[in-house]
Each structure stands twice: as structure tokens, then as C-alpha cells.
């Protein structure tokens, strides 16, 4: 109508998808009677009657809104349930009396998108690409209206940058009317981006205000050429013979280049390629002193066939040679003296010490051991240990046996053995001397001799316990070129009062196993009363 005031802006009603929109007819009483109102939806400038109010009673018109409209607030408000994105339009109420007036409402619909799904280029990005490559995608599904996307690198928003950064966003409309946004980040990356954290952020609006959702942070596989190659040895620190040593080639490129490890031949000074395992690691196990030398690594880029050489690395496998002792098999008379000398070579300074084998007692710190006024007890083992103090575990030893000339020497002079009549006894007798003695028994039985070491012998005798044997006892005699010596075993009959709770234990060097004469397989070790050992 000419001269009529311009239509006021529609009232804004904001609502989330799925909820109920309350459309309040804002006509004043002077503009119209709310008991007689028509409601319209306006889509593409076309009005469609959707609801009538007559005498305060509401009636839906057939069509898309038929099932979702109802009156509230004594007829002043129209409720639209289950709001969808398609409901985003203008609704107007029109009063019929006293004259036709209308009130317009703009319905705005919102839905938060799902969590953004970020995906990284599964093949990675080479730094030498000629143009920006697809780095990652960000998908925000089922939002309304279309959310805005912002890409971040290391917490800073990424801006479009000619030939460097390009963000390509597109959207699709689902059958529900909701939008799915896909954004592709294209960029030319540099080596430093290998550790960069990328994420995307979706910005969207709800009736409650502006919101955002962030994706997880991702790193992008970045490929860049090798510039430097170096060798790494494990374990670090001083190496010794016997260690497991790993020599590996490392490079600062991704993917790692193809490697080979070479060792300089000390005589020809030529580099000779070593055989590495499937992982390109040279494993020296056990490491030997021959593994010492100069190693280097060569790396090839298989695309360009350009090779890079590492700085050479000197490898030192520390060692101690076999230990030599002189004299090697010493023999001495009682009362004489002996000097034992120990020698060894090493890649480091050596420390020597002499230990008594039987007791591990340290006798001397140094390569020379002097023994004076030798007694029979001085016979036996002496161990020289050559060690590198700066490298724990690097040592070699040599054992030397000293023999003292002398007649046989018995482990015990006499011993009592508890027995039962008609049992088979297992008796043992031990003697030492130089030259090594032989042992004989004064009774018939099955005897067997065992050499314990060059100066010591153990004889065992199986004999049947008889009344005569109980009377006489048993003697063992040890003899060599320098004399003889005897031990006596007294046999005592066991009765029940003699046995103690630990009667199956043995003491001393002599074990006596008694078994019934009729049951050869059944053996029981009888208890011997402890006696002080007599020697000589």
C-alpha cells in the first residue's frame, strides 16, 4: 500500500534440530484479535497456510506441518515440534479482525556437527614436492548451518599462502538437510614439519551462542633427503672381548637410505664391506680383539644413487691375552722355596694378583708370588688373575698346581662306622702325596680307585659285614715311592638306642652305605660319629 511504513524486521527465534520452536504471535490487541489468526510458512516468497485459529481453537492444514503443530499460551503461541533444517524459514501470523495485520517470525535452526574426523595423508609428504600436497582432511558431519573450519599448526591458525598453503573446503547436504563439511589442507612442508602438530577446529553457532569442536592432534609423515650419516656403537664406553657389540649406521633422512658398513683392512688400508643383519646392523658377538679397527658407513639414496660417507670411527675391543705362569708344573721338596711368575698382554694396563685356589685367599698383588719354607700343606692350586681395573669383567686367569714331594698323607687316621650285620658296606679312604699314592685294603672286597687330582686319590671298598670283620675292623694303606701310611675304620654294631634322629646323615670324607645282603638295591647311608681328622 503506497505510503505504508516499511515492514519491520521479523522476530528471530533460534532453536536446535529436534527440539520444539515456540512461535509467539506478536500482534497487539489493537492490531488484531488473537482468537482469529491464520499462520503461514513462507518459502521462496511463497506463502502456505499451515494453521488456523478460530475462537481460540487451532486446526492444522494438511501438508508437511500437519502432525507437528499445536497451540499454546491460550492461543498466542504456535508450537512446532521436531524441528528440522528444512524448517528454517519465515513464519507469519495474520489477524483477521478488525483489519488484516501480520507478524513475521524468522526461525533459525542449528545443530552442532559431530566431532571433527581428521585424517593424515597415509603415504606422507615429500619436502621436495613441486606443489602443495594433500596433508590432511577434516570432516565435520551433520551440522547446521555449515560450520566454519580453521586449520592449526603447532597451535597457530594456518592462513592461505600462495603456492604454500591451500585450504579447500566443500560441503554435501545429507537427506536430513544437515551439512557435512570436508576440508582438505594442502601444503608444501619442510623438514621441520616432521614434528609439527596439526589439528582442525569446527566453529558453529547454537541458540546458546558460538561454539567450537577440535579434532585430535596429528603429525604428518614427512620425507626429506639424507644430509648426514654417522655410526653408532652399542654398548657405549669401553668394549671388551666377549661383549655383544652392535654397530649401526644412522642418517638424518626419512625414509632412511640404504646403508653399508665397511672396516679398513689394516694391511691393505682398503675399506672392506662387512656383513650386516636384515636391519643393517653389524653385530659382533662375541667381540674379539681382531674386530678392533676403523669403521665407516656409506649411505645411498636409491632414487638418485648419490652416496654419503660417515666420519670414520675407531673401534677398540679391549682384551687380555692368555695368562702364562712359569714354572707351569712346579714340584718342590718340603722346606724349599718357589717363585711363580705371571705374564699376560692387554690393550690396557694390567693388574695381577695371586690367589689360593682352595680358599680364594689373595696371597699377592702383583705378577710374582714367592713361597718360602714350603710345607706339605702348601701343595695344591695357585691362581694368577690378570685384570684391567678400568674395565670391570675384563680378566683372564691361569691355575698352576704345586706338588710337594712327600709320603702319603691320610685324610683321617681312624674312624668309627656304625653298621648292621650282613649288610654290604661302602667304605672310602682318601690319601694325598707326591708322587700320587695308591691305596690297598686289608680285607677282600670290591675296591675302586678315583684320582681326585694329581696328588690325591680316593678309594672305595664294598664289603660284607661279618662277625670277623666286626672284630678286626678295616685298614686302608696308601703308599708311594717315599713311604706309606694307614687309616683304620672301626666297625660298631647299631642297636636302637644308638640311632639318633639324624642317623641318615654322614660326616667326614668316608661314607659308609649299608644295605641288607639279600636286597642289593636297597641302600641306606649310615651315620658315622664325627671324629677329629688326623693327618700324617
Amino acid at each position: 500500500v503506497p505510503g505504508e511504513a516499511e515492514q519491520p524486521a521479523p522476530e528471530l527465534v533460534e532453536v536446535e534440530v529436534g527440539s520444539t520452536a515456540l512461535l509467539k504471535c506478536g500482534l497487539s490487541q489493537s492490531q488484531g484479535n488473537l482468537s482469529h489468526v491464520d499462520w503461514f510458512s513462507v518459502h521462496k516468497e511463497k506463502r502456505t497456510l499451515i494453521f488456523r485459529v478460530r475462537q481460540g481453537q487451532g486446526q492444522s492444514e494438511p501438508g508437511e506441518y500437519e502432525q507437528r503443530l499445536s497451540l499454546q499460551d491460550r492461543g498466542a503461541t504456535l508450537a512446532l515440534t521436531q524441528v528440522t533444517p528444512q524448517d528454517e524459514r519465515i513464519f507469519l501470523c495474520q489477524g483477521k479482525r478488525p483489519r488484516s495485520q501480520e507478524y513475521r517470525i524468522q526461525l533459525r535452526v542449528y545443530k552442532a556437527p559431530e566431532e571433527p574426523n581428521i585424517q593424515v595423508n597415509p603415504l606422507g609428504i615429500p619436502v621436495n614436492s613441486k606443489e602443495p600436497e594433500e596433508v590432511a582432511t577434516c570432516v565435520g558431519r551433520n551440522g547446521y548451518p555449515i560450520p566454519q573450519v580453521i586449520w592449526y599448526k603447532n597451535g597457530r591458525p594456518l592462513k592461505e599462502e600462495k603456492n604454500r598453503v591451500h585450504i579447500q573446503s566443500s560441503q554435501t547436504v545429507e537427506s536430513s538437510g544437515l551439512y557435512t563439511l570436508q576440508s582438505i589442507l594442502k601444503a608444501q612442508l619442510v623438514k621441520e614439519d616432521k614434528d609439527a602438530q596439526f589439528y582442525c577446529e569446527l566453529n558453529y553457532r547454537l541458540p546458546s551462542g558460538n561454539h567450537m569442536k577440535e579434532s585430535r592432534e596429528v603429525t604428518v609423515p614427512v620425507f626429506y633427503p639424507t644430509e648426514k650419516v654417522w655410526l653408532e656403537v652399542e654398548p657405549v664406553g669401553m668394549l671388551k672381548e666377549g661383549d655383544r657389540v652392535e654397530i649401526r649406521c644412522l642418517a638424518d633422512g626419512n625414509p632412511p637410505p640404504h646403508f653399508s658398513i665397511s672396516k679398513q683392512n689394516p694391511s691393505t688400508r682398503e675399506a672392506e664391506e662387512e656383513t650386516t643383519n636384515d636391519n643393517g646392523v653389524l653385530v659382533l658377538e662375541p667381540a674379539r680383539k681382531e674386530h678392533s679397527g676403523r669403521y665407516e658407513c656409506q649411505a645411498w639414496n636409491l632414487d638418485t644413487m648419490i652416496s654419503l660417507l660417515s666420519e670414520p670411527q675407531e673401534l677398540l675391543v679391549n682384551y687380555v691375552s692368555d695368562v702364562r705362569v712359569s714354572p707351569a708344573a712346579p714340584e718342590r721338596q718340603e722346606g724349599s722355596s718357589l717363585t711363580l711368575t705371571c705374564e699376560a698382554e692387554s690393550s690396557q694396563d694390567l693388574e695381577f694378583q695371586w690367589l689360593r685356589e682352595e680358599t680364594d685367599q689373595v696371597l699377592e698383588r702383583g705378577p710374582v708370588l714367592q713361597l718360602h719354607d714350603l710345607k706339605r700343606e702348601a701343595g695344591g692350586g695357585y691362581r694368577c688373575v690378570a685384570s684391567v681395573p678400568s674395565i670391570p669383567g675384563l680378566n683372564r686367569t691361569q691355575l698352576v698346581k704345586l706338588a710337594i714331594f712327600g709320603p702319603p698323607w691320610m685324610a683321617f687316621k681312624e674312624r668309627k662306622v656304625w653298621v648292621k650285620e650282613n649288610m654290604v658296606l661302602n667304605l672310602s679312604c682318601e690319601a694325598s702325596g707326591h708322587p700320587r699314592p695308591t691305596i690297598s685294603w686289608n680285607v677282600n672286597g670290591t675296591a675302586s680307585e678315583q684320582d681326585q687330582d694329581p696328588q690325591r686319590v680316593l678309594s672305595t671298598l664294598n664289603v660284607l659285614v661279618t662277625p670277623e670283620l666286626l672284630e678286626t675292623g678295616v685298614e686302608c694303606t696308601a703308599s708311594n715311592d717315599l713311604g706309606k701310611n694307614t687309616s683304620i675304620l672301626f666297625l660298631e654294631l647299631v642297636n636302637l638306642t644308638t640311632l639318633t634322629p639324624d642317623s641318615n646323615t654322614t660326616t667326614g670324607l668316608s661314607t659308609s652305605t649299608a644295605s641288607p645282603h639279600t636286597r642289593a638295591n636297597s641302600t641306606s647311608t649310615e651315620r658315622k660319629l664325627p671324629e677329629p681328622e688326623s693327618r700324617g
Epitope: 585424517q119 597415509p122 603415504l123 614436492s129 613441486k130 606443489e131 602443495p132 600436497e133 594433500e134 582432511t137
Partner: antibody
């Protein structure tokens, strides 16, 4: 509409080089990457190589250095070369379009037989 | 390399059945998984991408679900034309495929 078509010799002698061509239509090779995938008889699918929209090339390390992928954007063709062929390389060879990281369109495939 | 394990390798079902195919990644691949249908003499067809997004033109009886390591392709009402071999593929790191599930009619 988007289409991909593989072509190449059906039969190749072992130790020879295989050359395959993937001719595309309905999209530009500067907008989408292309991958080659193969399926040996009675077996699963195996990714071989790819060329990105930006022209970067990628290879499956299992093929060592037997592969070469390239493209001719003006002819809308992606080429795959595989040398030192063995009988185990027999199978159906497919090319597929990237969108941008999954494969949304594939060719029908070309059967390659390696004879000894 | 990320391994993808598919199960079952063979599945017999009747027309109208609800069919479920499984795919398991050897590590977390988030939602970087696609499902394909492969018929002899035809180009492989993308059914599902991003684990649960239906490719344009694919009937709504197909749906995908899962995230992380465990994924499922469901056909709500099996049709005769669905007889094929189905493959899943991860594209989180490189490209690897499952060994396939052959779907046949009972």
C-alpha cells in the same frame, strides 16, 4: 563421469619389464592421486604404488626398487613399470583414484600373466 | 606395517538375511577404514569410507561402524546381487587390505 581403464600386455616373460597404463576421464590427475593395486590369483589385494595430485611418487617397499610410477597429465595417463618380473607377479592389476586418501573409483583391472 | 584381519573368510547367507562382516586393525587406525565389493570382471566398488560414511549411490542396506581397531560392515537385507568378495582397507598409514570375505548364497 569418473572412469579409469587399465591397459597393458596380457603375457610377459619372467625377468622382463611390465608396463601398464591407466587412462582416466571425468577428473584431472592434478586434482586427484592414483594408486596401482594388484590381486594375485586366489589372494587378497596388495597396494603397489601411487602418484599424488602434486606429482609425488610412493612405492610399496616389498617391491624393493623394481617399480617406477609416472604420469602424463595432458594425456590423463598414469604409467607403472615393474622390472625383473617373476611368476609370483601374475595377477589382476587395478588402478584406483584417491579421494583424497581412500580409493573411490577403480578400473576393471587388467590380467597379467608372467610365464617362465 | 599395519595388518588388517578380516573375518569370516567365507560366509553363507540367505536372501533377506542380516549379514555382518568384521575387520580388525593391528593398531588404532581411528576411522581410516573403507569397505569394497569385488566381483569378477567388474571394477571394485567403494561401499563405505571413513568407517561409517556411505558412498554416494550405494544402497542404504549397507552400513559401516567401528573406530580404533574393530570395524563392521552390515548388510541389513541381503540381495542376490550382493554375492561377491568384500575387502576392508586401512588408510591410516600406508594402504593395506584385509584378506577378504567371500559372501555366497545358501
Amino acid at each position: 563421469q569418473v572412469q579409469l581403464k587399465e591397459s597393458g600386455p596380457g603375457l610377459v616373460q619372467s625377468s622382463q619389464t611390465l608396463s601398464l597404463t591407466c587412462t582416466v576421464s571425468g577428473f584431472s590427475l592434478t586434482s586427484n592421486g592414483v594408486s596401482w593395486v594388484r590381486q594375485p590369483p586366489g589372494k587378497g589385494l596388495e597396494w603397489i604404488a601411487a602418484i599424488s595430485s602434486g606429482g609425488s611418487t610412493y612405492y610399496n617397499s616389498a617391491f624393493k626398487s623394481r617399480l617406477s610410477i609416472s604420469r602424463n597429465t595432458s594425456k590423463s595417463q598414469v604409467l607403472l613399470k615393474m622390472n625383473s618380473l617373476q611368476t609370483e607377479d601374475t595377477g589382476m592389476y587395478f588402478c584406483a583414484r584417491h579421494r583424497p586418501f581412500y580409493f573411490d573409483y577403480w578400473g576393471q583391472g587388467v590380467m597379467v600373466t608372467v610365464s617362465s | 606395517d599395519i595388518r588388517v584381519t578380516q573375518s569370516p573368510s567365507l560366509l553363507s547367507a540367505s536372501v533377506g538375511d542380516r549379514v555382518t562382516l568384521n575387520c580388525k586393525g593391528s593398531q588404532n587406525i581411528y576411522k581410516s577404514l573403507a569397505w569394497f565389493r569385488l566381483k569378477r570382471g567388474e571394477a571394485p566398488k567403494l561401499l563405505i569410507y571413513d568407517a561409517n560414511s556411505l558412498q554416494t549411490g550405494i544402497p542404504s542396506r549397507f552400513s559401516g561402524s567401528g573406530s580404533g581397531t574393530d570395524f563392521t560392515l552390515t548388510i541389513t537385507s541381503l540381495q542376490p546381487e550382493d554375492v561377491a568378495t568384500y575387502f576392508c582397507q586401512q588408510y591410516y598409514s600406508g594402504y593395506t587390505f584385509g584378506a577378504g570375505t567371500k559372501l555366497e548364497l545358501k
